[in-house]
C-alpha cells in the first residue's frame, strides 16, 4: 500500500540538475530539502527505482537550537566515469511519516563521439577466400554511421552508404589492413586496424604416385597463394596403429608425426624410412612468406609388403638311415610382411637342386630312398611373403645321426597333395 497521499507541500527546495557528457565523464547531482524535526534519509531514484549502491553523501545542517527546529538536508550523488547504463531520470526521494515525497527530476544523458562495441579483429584467411569482418558502434547521439576502410582507402563514398555492421570481403590476394570509422553528430572515432594475413589455400588432391616397402612417393596440387609464391610444403606421416582413429579432418594424431619438407615445385615428395606393410596417414600443408596453409585432411595410405630381410635361423639337418630331418626357426631379421611359408632347397655334389615349398612348418622329414650314398648333400631354407622370397640361408650339410645324439622327434608329414620326396638320381 502507498505510504499515504501527498497532501502536504513538497519539502524539496532544490532539485537535481541535468548532466550530459561523453563516456568517462564524472559529475554530481544535488538535491536539497528543508524539513522540521529529525532529518530523513534521502534516497536517489533512477527511472523510478531506488539506487541501492549509490555513491551519495548527505549533509544535514540545523537551522535552530532545538531538535524540532528546521533542518536543511543536502544529498549529492556522484557519477564517476559516465556509461550508457547511468543515463536516465534521477530524483531524490524521502519518506516523511506516512508520506512519500519525490523531487523534480534531473536527467543524465550521454552524448559524445561514437563508442565501439565491436571492432575488426586480426585474422588469417586463405587466398581468394570470402570472409566477413564486424564493426559496431553506438552513440548517443544516434545515428552512428560506419565507413569501412581497406589499406586506409574508404570502401564507400560516404559514411552510412556502404556496408555497416558486417563487411563481406569476397577474397584477398595480398595481406591487407581494415578499419572502420564511426560518424555521428559529435564527430568521428576510428576503430583499431585489423591485419588480415593472406595464407596459401589448402593443397588439394593429395595422392600416392608410387609405393615401395619402405618408401612412398606422394604428390599434391597446391592451392592459390595470392601474390606470395610458395616457399615449401611440409608433409607429415603418422603410423595408423589399430584403433588410433584418425578420421578425415580429425585433429592432431596421438603420436609425434614424421615430418618432411619439400622444395616446390615439383609438388611431389619421396617419404623414406617407413615400415613395410604398414598403414600410415599422411597430410600436407604449403607455406608462403605469410605463413602456412591449413593442413589437408589425413589420407590413409599403406606401404606394400616386402620380402624377409634375412634367412631362417638355426637350421639343422641330420640324417638317420633313409630319413633326413631338417628344422629351423623364423628369421630374426624383419619379415616386411606376413610370413606365408618357407622354401627348402637341397642339392648333392653332382646333382641338380631340388626346391620344395614347406608351408608354415619349421621342420620337415625327408624320406630318402637308396643307401644314401650321395656325397656332400646340403640344404638351404628361405622364408617368403606375398612379395617374394627372402634371402636363402647358407648351405647346411646333412650330418649323419650318431647314436647318443638326441634324435629329433619329427612327424613325417605325407599329405596327399605333397608326396614324399625321393632322390631321383639314386
Amino acid at each position: 500500500a502507498p505510504r499515504g497521499t501527498q497532501a502536504e507541500e513538497s519539502p524539496f527546495v532544490g532539485n537535481p540538475g541535468n548532466i550530459t557528457g561523453a563516456r568517462g565523464l564524472t559529475g554530481t547531482l544535488r538535491c536539497q530539502l528543508q524539513v522540521q524535526g529529525e532529518p530523513p534519509e534521502v534516497h536517489w531514484l533512477r527511472d523510478g527505482q531506488i539506487l541501492e549502491l549509490a555513491d551519495s553523501t548527505q549533509t544535514q545542517v540545523p537551522l535552530g537550537e532545538d531538535e524540532q527546529d528546521d533542518w536543511i538536508v543536502v544529498s549529492q550523488l556522484r557519477i564517476t566515469s559516465l556509461q550508457l547504463s547511468d543515463t536516465g531520470q534521477y530524483q531524490c526521494l524521502v519518506f516523511l511519516g506516512h508520506q512519500t515525497f519525490v523531487s523534480q527530476p534531473g536527467y543524465v544523458g550521454l552524448e559524445g563521439l561514437p563508442y565501439f562495441l565491436e571492432e575488426p579483429e586480426d585474422r588469417t584467411v586463405a587466398a581468394n577466400t570470402p570472409f566477413n569482418l564486424s564493426c559496431q558502434a553506438q552513440g548517443p547521439p544516434e545515428p552512428v554511421d560506419l565507413l569501412w576502410l581497406q589499406d586506409a582507402v574508404p570502401l564507400a563514398t560516404a559514411p552510412g552508404h556502404g556496408p555497416q555492421r558486417s563487411l563481406h570481403v569476397p577474397g584477398l590476394n595480398k595481406t591487407s589492413s581494415f578499419s572502420c570509422e564511426a560518424h555521428n553528430a559529435k564527430g568521428v572515432t576510428t576503430s583499431r586496424t585489423a591485419t588480415i594475413t593472406v595464407l596459401p589455400q589448402q593443397p588439394r588432391n593429395l595422392h600416392l604416385v608410387s609405393r615401395q616397402p619402405t618408401e612412398l612417393e606422394v604428390a599434391w596440387t597446391p592451392g592459390l597463394s595470392g601474390i606470395y609464391p610458395l616457399t615449401h610444403c611440409t608433409l607429415q606421416a603418422v603410423l595408423s596403429d589399430d584403433g588410433m582413429g584418425i578420421q578425415a579432418g580429425e585433429p592432431d594424431p596421438p603420436e609425434e608425426p614424421l615430418t618432411s619438407q619439400a622444395s616446390v615445385p615439383p609438388h611431389q615428395l619421396r617419404l623414406g624410412s617407413l615400415h613395410p606393410h604398414t598403414p600410415y596417414h599422411i597430410r600436407v600443408a604449403c607455406t608462403s612468406s605469410q605463413g602456412p596453409s591449413s593442413w589437408t585432411h589425413w589420407l590413409p595410405v599403406e606401404t606394400p609388403e616386402g620380402v624377409p630381410l634375412g634367412p631362417p635361423e638355426n637350421i639343422s639337418a641330420t640324417r638317420n638311415g633313409s630319413q633326413a630331418f631338417v628344422h629351423w626357426q623364423e628369421p630374426r631379421a624383419p619379415l616386411q610382411g606376413t610370413l606365408l611359408g618357407y622354401r627348402l632347397a637341397y642339392q648333392g655334389q653332382d646333382t641338380p637342386e631340388v626346391l620344395m615349398d614347406i608351408g608354415l612348418r619349421q621342420e620337415v622329414t625327408l624320406e630318402l630312398q637308396g643307401d644314401g650314398s650321395v656325397s656332400n648333400l646340403t640344404v638351404c631354407v628361405a622364408a617368403y611373403t606375398a612379395a617374394g622370397d627372402g634371402p636363402w640361408s647358407l648351405p647346411v650339410p646333412l650330418e649323419a645321426w650318431r647314436p647318443g645324439q638326441a634324435q629329433p622327434v619329427h612327424q613325417l608329414v605325407k599329405e596327399p597333395s605333397t608326396p614324399a620326396f625321393s632322390w631321383p638320381w639314386w
Partner: antibody
Framework: QVQLQQSGPELVKPGASVKISCKAS????????IHWVQQRPGQGLEWIGW????????KYNEKFKDKATLTADTSSGTAYMQLSSLTSDDSAVFYC???????????????WGQGTLVTVSA | DIQMTQTTSSLSASLGDRVTISCRAS??????LNWYQQKPDGTVKLLIY???RLHSRVPSRFSGSGSGTDYSLTISNLEQEDIATYFC?????????FGGGTKLEIK
Amino acid sequence: QVQLQQSGPELVKPGASVKISCKASGYSFTSYYIHWVQQRPGQGLEWIGWIYPGSDNTKYNEKFKDKATLTADTSSGTAYMQLSSLTSDDSAVFYCARNYYDYDGGTWFPYWGQGTLVTVSA
Amino acid sequence: DIQMTQTTSSLSASLGDRVTISCRASQDINYYLNWYQQKPDGTVKLLIYYTSRLHSRVPSRFSGSGSGTDYSLTISNLEQEDIATYFCQQGNTLPWTFGGGTKLEIK
C-alpha cells in the same frame, strides 16, 4: 485509496490508431510512474514502457518504440497511450499500472487498471 | 533482455493442497522477483514483491522464496478463490519482463 480507471474497449480498423486512457486517483499523480503492459489473447504480459507525469519523461521497451506513444495530462491526472499503424497482431488487452517506492529498490506494480481490450479487425 | 520462464503452463490441484509454482530467470535478478495473480475476469493483483515480501491484504497462505535465477511461489492451503493465472516479473533490469504464466485449476 489508489485507483486506476481505464477507458472502455475499442474496435479499430487495420492501419488506424487508437488512444486509450488511464485516470489515476488517490495519490499525487506527478510523483509516481505510470507503466503500460500488453497482454495478447492467451499470452503472457509484456511491458511497453513508462511515463513520469511530473516531467513527461518516458522510457519504452525497444519492441514497442514505434508502436506506442505515452503522454499524460497532469490537470486531469490521466495517462494516455496511443497505438499507431495497428494490425491484427496488436489485438490485446492493455493495462496501466503504477509503481511503488521502497527502501529495497526494484520495480513492481501494486496498482493496476482493469485493462482495455483493443480489437483490430476489418 | 532477461527471459523469465515458467515451465508449467497449467496446474491442477485439489482444495487444501499445497501448490508450488516456479519461475526461472535467464540471469541473476538479485531477489527483484515479484508475483502477480490474474483472475479469469482479467483483474491483476500484486501478491509478493522482492522475492518473499507479502503485499498488503494478501492472505498469509501465499509465500515466496528463491535467489539468483530460481524462484517459487507457494500456496499452502489452496482455496477456491485462488483459481487464477500466476505471473512472475523481474524488477531488476529494464525492460521489465514477465513469465508466461501458470494457470491454476481445481481437480
